[in-house]
């Protein structure tokens, strides 16, 4: 059940600059946000920044600037030292803690083929002379048409022609960038999230947060749901995502039903209430 989203972007203007965006999807009061790289905080990761709603922020190189974007999301600008571009293959994790109920953490990384400022690089298209293309195209259509008619006639000898159903292509699936689950753990998870649940709840924000938080950034509104989001399940969005439990961070399995108020971005379509306790790691 994702409650934390993570998005890593390469800045279009400076190729050595990266920004990590993280947000908490839920009404709980955030008491601390920790951003780490190389793995989760407290589990092999190295702290990059700590943001406290009242006490301010602390950051460590290569973090350049950590700031709150809304009451439930933060961004962290990073300066890549250059040469080997270590950020490209690095996992960034964000942990949102709500005391004493618990902490929710999720990890993400830059998509392997990220062009600055783009969701995915454009696919090169081979150039073909217009006249040749026209001839080839027409020939192809005629050949295909004849072949198809012959095929239909042959089938009609044996049985009535079946009604052809239009193929419902999901345009969203064609244009969207895939959102993938976080880096798989090398450890034997509770037996590594063996099954993948690709169900999605309607990603709608139909009411404000109970505690009046600022509304979520738009790119938080489309997320994989649950332990879950399949690596091949596409959702329209920019940048790279990455949360499947916070899951805080979860193995696939039955999801609670869709019963909650307002925020319907979770696998259970309700998100944690102000005090859903889960995992209080700080």
């Amino acid at each position: 059940t994702p409650e934390v989203w993570v998005q890593v972007q390469m800045e279009a203007t400076e190729l050595s600059s990266f920004t990590v965006h993280c947000g908490f999807l839920g009404p709980g009061s955030i008491s601390l946000v920790t951003v780490s790289w190389g793995g989760p905080d407290g589990a092999g990761g190295t702290k990059l920044a700590v943001l406290h709603p009242e006490l301010g922020t602390r950051q460590w190189a290569p973090a350049r600037q950590a700031r709150w974007e809304t009451q439930s999301s933060i961004s962290l600008a990073l300066e890549d030292s250059g040469a080997s571009s270590p950020f490209a293959n690095t996992t960034f994790c964000c942990k949102f803690a709500s005391f004493p109920e618990g902490s929710w953490e999720s990890c993400g990384s830059l998509p392997p083929s990220s062009d600055p400022g783009l969701s995915a690089p454009p696919t090169p298209v081979p150039i073909l002379r217009a006249d040749l293309a026209g001839i080839l195209g027409l020939s192809g259509v005629l050949l295909f048409g004849c072949g198809y008619l012959l095929h239909l006639l042959r089938r009609q000898k044996h049985r009535p022609t079946p009604r052809l159903q239009p193929s419902h292509t999901n345009s969203q699936a064609l244009t969207a960038q895939a959102w993938a689950p976080s880096q798989a753990s090398q450890a034997a998870l509770h037996d590594p999230y063996a099954t993948i649940n690709t169900s999605f709840c309607p990603a709608t924000l139909d009411t404000a947060h109970p505690n009046g938080w600022a509304s979520l950034p738009t790119h938080a509104a489309h997320q994989p749901q649950g332990p879950a989001a399949s690596a091949s399940t596409p959702i329209l969005a920019r940048g790279s995502f990455v949360s499947v439990e916070n899951g805080l961070y979860t193995q696939a399995g039955e999801r609670p039903p869709h019963t909650g108020p307002g925020l319907t971005l979770f696998p259970d379509c309700r998100g944690p209430r102000a005090v859903e306790g889960r995992f209080g790691v700080r």
């Epitope: 793995g39 989760p40 953490e105 899951g247 961070y249 039955e254 999801r255 859903e276 209080g280 700080r282």
Partner: antibody
Framework: EVQLQESGAEHVMPGASVKMSCKAA????????MYWVKQRPGQGLEWIGT????????SYNQKFRGKATLTVDESSSTAYMQLSSLTSEDSAVYYC???????????????WGQGTSVTVSS | QNVLTQSPAIMSASPGEKVTITCSAG?????MHWFQQKPGTSPKLWIY???NLASGVPARFSGSGSGTSYSLTISRMEAEDAATYYC?????????FGSGTKLEIK
């Protein structure tokens, strides 16, 4: 290896106080909250409270407010729980546990101390 | 506080048998967590967030439920599963545990 080592059994008089410890090893102490649970002989589990090991913030079960006091000593990576004005109802095993976190695609594990047995009798 | 009632309080099952333990909450909760405890040992997180197995828990265990009704199921009972199981809610303070279900092997 993560370990939570609790102090030994206590036999105390009614009305007295007792302070038990929970020494953490194998991880960064301040990265995880610590919570305490009571279990009376042959009975179920009761959440006493949670302490934020980093900023020492506490949250108590109302039932144990005034009875239990949670503290930590970061320098020795130790959490403490003091129980005051003891009665026979306080005779139980008390566990400290490292609160768990869920992180996408990482294993979820919790760690508990072995428990401290407290017997209150005259 | 939110009282969690587990049933049955005690049950025994034969090896290979399917076992279901239920936990009923006095008021609705978002998720239920389950702990396993064997005599003389500390409890262990067994299932978290209703349906997710903690590290090292055999796949024959599963959890489900919503609202006020949750359950833990063992598809095929094994001797090592004999223990007491507790449900826990962390949706409202104070966090509460169920009274426990003692599962024995026949």
């Amino acid at each position: 290896e993560v370990q939570l080592q609790e102090s030994g059994a206590e036999h105390v008089m009614p009305g007295a106080s007792v302070k038990m410890s929970c020494k953490a090893a194998g991880y960064t102490f301040t990265d995880y909250w610590m919570y305490w649970v009571k279990q009376r002989p042959g009975q179920g589990l009761e959440w006493i409270g949670t302490i934020d090991t980093s900023d020492h913030k506490t949250s108590y079960n109302q039932k144990f407010r005034g009875k239990a006091t949670l503290t930590v000593d970061e320098s020795s990576s130790t959490a403490y729980m003091q129980l005051s004005s003891l009665t026979s109802e306080d005779s139980a095993v008390y566990y400290c546990a490292r609160d768990f976190i869920i992180t996408v695609n990482y294993p979820v594990v919790d760690y508990w101390g072995q428990g401290t047995s407290v017997t209150v009798s005259s | 506080q939110n009282v969690l009632t587990q049933s049955p309080a005690i049950m025994s099952a034969s090896p290979g048998e399917k076992v279901t333990i239920t936990c009923s909450a006095g008021s609705s909760v978002n998720y239920m967590h389950w702990f396993q405890q064997k005599p003389g040992t500390s409890p262990k997180l067994w299932i978290y967030s209703t349906s997710n197995l903690a590290s090292g828990v055999p796949a024959r265990f599963s959890g489900s439920g919503s609202g006020t009704s949750y359950s833990l199921t063992i598809s095929r009972m094994e001797a090592e599963d004999a223990a007491t199981y507790y449900c826990q809610q962390r949706s409202s303070l104070p966090f509460t545990f169920g009274s426990g279900t003692k599962l024995e092997i026949k």
